[in-house]
């Protein structure tokens, strides 16, 4: 039976009809009392006092309502949940993930996990209603957990008309290769000992380091991974592992040449709730590699939205060459990652200036052959974008990737809903399209426009009458991603390039074929 529920937009927790709850008001000491009425949360401020007993984990501040028994935790940065039990910065799980308390919420199939408090799970052996739920990491959230000591974190997903458990695609902290680091590498305990410039690291117990804070003599040295070795470490929460080096007889430090363990192409997909012409409104967490590129124009004040882009490494964005025909100076460009609404700043967005951009030398502005460009983000260190649930790289395809004809893939962007619309979309959209066979991706299928071997076609193959809402890219989506699932990860197959109109039956969109440019990409991204 259909149940009316409320979703608290601030915390993403769900509540049944007439259920009440407390929530802290961000960036203030106020607390609100909310209750679920016909699918809408109604909230007002209530007086609170300090809790009579500690109930919050991880340094959370407990407050309880003055006139009834509920309590609320004000969580320190990096923690969330009713009792601050959720570690929002955990990027991977250790061992079997029994102690994993991160926010990954996507199953291996790509399905979105179900909230553990959902009434649909009430009869399941593991749900947020269990008396020991908090101890097991279960609660009013849909994050992957391993409450039954299985081999890795899992969750319940709704498929084939029922709820069943499925393993999650949460990254493991040591995917058989501990000589790479996750997140900022604070937990890195590998044996790399060279810096990015090729210099050898000094041992952490070297006499030269006397007076430095981070040495083998530090009281927390063991916990920080420092000792009688010269392996790269990140004891101070810097951007990535580093070490002390001697450069021209001068003591300094440098970031290390340790590869980051790839979490490319992993995402926390949520089923879009709203259909819109040409596709579906989406959240950035479902497409965390999507970038928005803005440009300052010489003639008009302010910035205007230019094109989409694709995050392929911490400091590099792929886009379409035709977006840069105006030859903007790099400092007139801005790249924004982690944004759901095109012109509304996101809470976790990251904004960058552009160091330089490289347009393919053989880009043809008549045919759009070689429609590819690379933008290097500006940063003070060797890292630019910081990985989070809303910012993550897409995987580049292997050179020999050949997906079957009609494989279902997806594209995303902030482009127009339809060709004749005067406006770009206010919110990120996604569209589901299928890869056309090369025999259906020719000039004769595209009004005699030139189609080269550097292009591929994809479109919505559903049969539809004149009112059908066929998915497609449109103006403003250019430079954005066409991604397909490969080996459990979303892999970049195409760059949105051109098309005839938008969403027309039997007229595919045309994309830059990324496998043809892997060497070009690698070559231009060299340090």
């Amino acid at each position: 039976s259909y149940q009316v529920i409320c979703r608290d937009e601030k915390t993403q927790m769900i509540y049944q009809q007439h259920q009440s709850w407390l929530r802290p008001v961000l960036r203030s000491n106020r607390v609100e009392y909310c209750w679920c009425n016909s699918g809408r949360a109604q909230c007002h401020s209530v007086p609170v006092k300090s809790c009579s007993e500690p109930r919050c984990f991880n340094g959370g501040t407990c407050q309880q309502a003055l006139y009834f028994s509920d309590f609320v935790c004000q969580c320190p940065e990096g923690f969330a949940g009713k009792c601050c039990e959720i570690d929002t910065r955990a990027t991977c799980y250790e061992d079997q993930g029994i102690s994993y308390r991160g926010t990954w919420s996507t199953a291996e199939s790509g399905a979105e996990c179900t909230n553990w408090n959902s009434s649909a799970l009430a009869q399941k052996p593991y749900s947020g209603r269990r008396p020991d739920a908090i101890r097991l990491g279960l609660g009013n959230h849909n994050y992957c957990r391993n409450p039954d000591r299985d081999s890795k974190p899992w969750c319940y997903v709704f498929k084939a008309g029922k709820y069943s458990s499925e393993f999650c695609s949460t990254p493991a902290c040591s995917e058989g290769n501990s000589d790479c680091y996750f997140g900022n590498g604070s937990a890195y305990r590998g044996t790399h000992s060279l810096t990015e410039s090729g210099a050898s690291c000094l041992p952490w117990n070297s006499m030269i380091l006397i007076g430095k804070v981070y040495t083998a003599q530090n009281p927390s040295a063991q916990a920080l991974g420092l000792g009688k070795h010269n392996y790269c470490r990140n004891p101070d929460g810097d951007a990535k592992p580093w070490c002390h080096v001697l450069k021209n007889r001068r003591l300094t430090w440098e970031y290390c040449d340790v590869p980051s363990c790839s979490t490319c192409g992993l995402r926390q997909y949520s089923q879009p709730q709203f259909r819109i012409k040409g596709g579906l409104f989406a959240d950035i967490a479902s497409h965390p590699w999507q970038a928005a590129i803005f440009a300052k124009h010489r003639r008009s004040p302010g910035e205007r939205f230019l094109c989409g882009g694709i995050l392929i490494s911490s400091c590099w964005i792929l886009s379409a060459a035709h977006c840069f025909q105006e030859r903007f100076p790099p400092h007139h460009l801005t790249v924004i990652l982690g944004r759901t609404y095109r012109v509304v700043p996101g809470e976790e967005e990251q904004k960058f200036e552009v160091e330089k951009y490289i347009v393919h030398k053989e880009f043809d502005d008549d045919t759009y052959d070689n429609d590819i460009a690379l933008l290097q983000l500006k940063s003070d260190s060797s890292r630019c974008a910081q990985e989070s649930s809303v910012v993550r790289t897409v995987c580049l395809p292997p050179a020999d990737l050949q997906l079957p004809d009609w494989t279902e893939c997806e594209l995303s962007g902030y482009g127009k809903h339809e060709a004749l619309s005067p406006f770009y979309s206010e919110r990120l959209k996604e569209a589901h399209v299928r890869l056309y066979p090369s025999s259906r991706c020719t000039s004769q299928h595209l009004l005699n426009r030139t189609v080269t071997d550097n292009m591929l076609c994809a479109g919505d193959t559903r049969s539809g009458g004149p009112q059908a809402n066929l998915h497609d890219a449109c103006q403003g989506d250019s430079g954005g991603p066409l991604v397909c699932l490969n080996d459990g990860r979303m892999t970049l197959v195409g760059i949105i390039s051109w098309g005839l109109g938008c969403g027309q039956k039997d007229v595919p969109g045309v994309y830059t074929k990324v496998t043809n440019y892997l060497d070009w990409i690698r070559d231009n991204m060299r340090p």
Epitope: V258, A399, P527
Partner: antibody
Framework: QVQLVQSGAEVKKPGASVKVSCKAS??????INWVRQATGQGLEWMGR????????YYAQKFQGRVTMTRNTSISTAYMELSSLRSEDTAVYYC?????????WGQGTLVTVSS | DVVMTQSPLSLPVTPGEPASISCRSS???????????LDWYLQKPGQSPQLLIY???NRASGVPDRFSGSGSGTDFTLKISRVEAEDVGVYYC?????????FGGGTKVEIK
């Protein structure tokens, strides 16, 4: 520290093929280049492979005769040269490229002789 | 293809004296990403080549500071401020800016 260890010397007949391997340890995400050197001659760049995606670039001179592959699970790159002739007698080196070819294998001598 | 021309072909040196090797490219070797991938390698007798200088003027790890590189566009120079006996071997310049990548013909440095 990246270390590259190459397979042993080979003797081949003209027209045959040779496959040289290069096992990498350390950071194996960089291009692997193949460079050859005939006795008493200079260094000649043959091409490169990206161990991650497997994309390749071959120098025109070797196009059609050389194939560079990799097996990521064992961190090994391979260079196969076919239709061998006597002038292919040389030491073949693999070299890992990040900002330059900072790490080199010990070389594999391939002798082509009837 | 970019042709790299080195001079001299052979360089007899006296230990303690300076030495200089020139390398000229047939066209500019500034890469489209703005970098100039001009490297110098030394191949000592019976050994694999080793990196000395990368991107024109950056000394590789462990390379003594008597080695320095300079130049731009098409003209590049490797200097050894005071040659030591262990510096003998063949020096190669190399461009990695335009494919196919190419080496210079080499300069043999030997003690007088």
């Amino acid at each position: 520290q990246v270390q590259l260890v190459q397979s042993g010397a080979e003797v081949k007949k003209p027209g045959a093929s040779v496959k040289v391997s290069c096992k990498a340890s350390g950071n194996t995400s960089y291009w692997i280049n193949w460079v050859r050197q005939a006795t008493g001659q200079g260094l000649e760049w043959m091409g490169r492979i990206d161990p991650g995606g497997g994309s390749t670039y071959y120098a025109q001179k070797f196009q059609g005769r050389v194939t560079m592959t990799r097996n990521t699970s064992i961190s090994t790159a391979y260079m196969e040269l076919s239709s061998l002739r006597s002038e292919d007698t040389a030491v073949y080196y693999c070299a890992s490229y990040y900002y330059a070819m900072a790490y080199w294998g010990q070389g594999t001598l391939v002798t082509v002789s009837s | 293809d970019v042709v790299m021309t080195q001079s001299p072909l052979s360089l007899p040196v006296t230990p303690g004296e300076p030495a200089s090797i020139s390398c000229r490219s047939s066209q500019s070797i500034v890469h489209s990403n703005g970098n100039t991938y001009l490297d110098w390698y030394l191949q000592k007798p019976g050994q694999s080549p080793q990196l000395l200088i990368y991107k024109v003027s950056n000394r590789a790890s462990g390379v003594p500071d008597r080695f320095s590189g300079s130049g731009s566009g098409t003209d590049f120079t490797l200097k050894i401020s005071r040659v030591e006996a262990e510096d003998v071997g063949v020096y190669y310049c190399f461009q990695g800016s335009h494919v196919p990548w190419t080496f210079g013909g080499g300069t043999k440095v030997e003690i007088k």
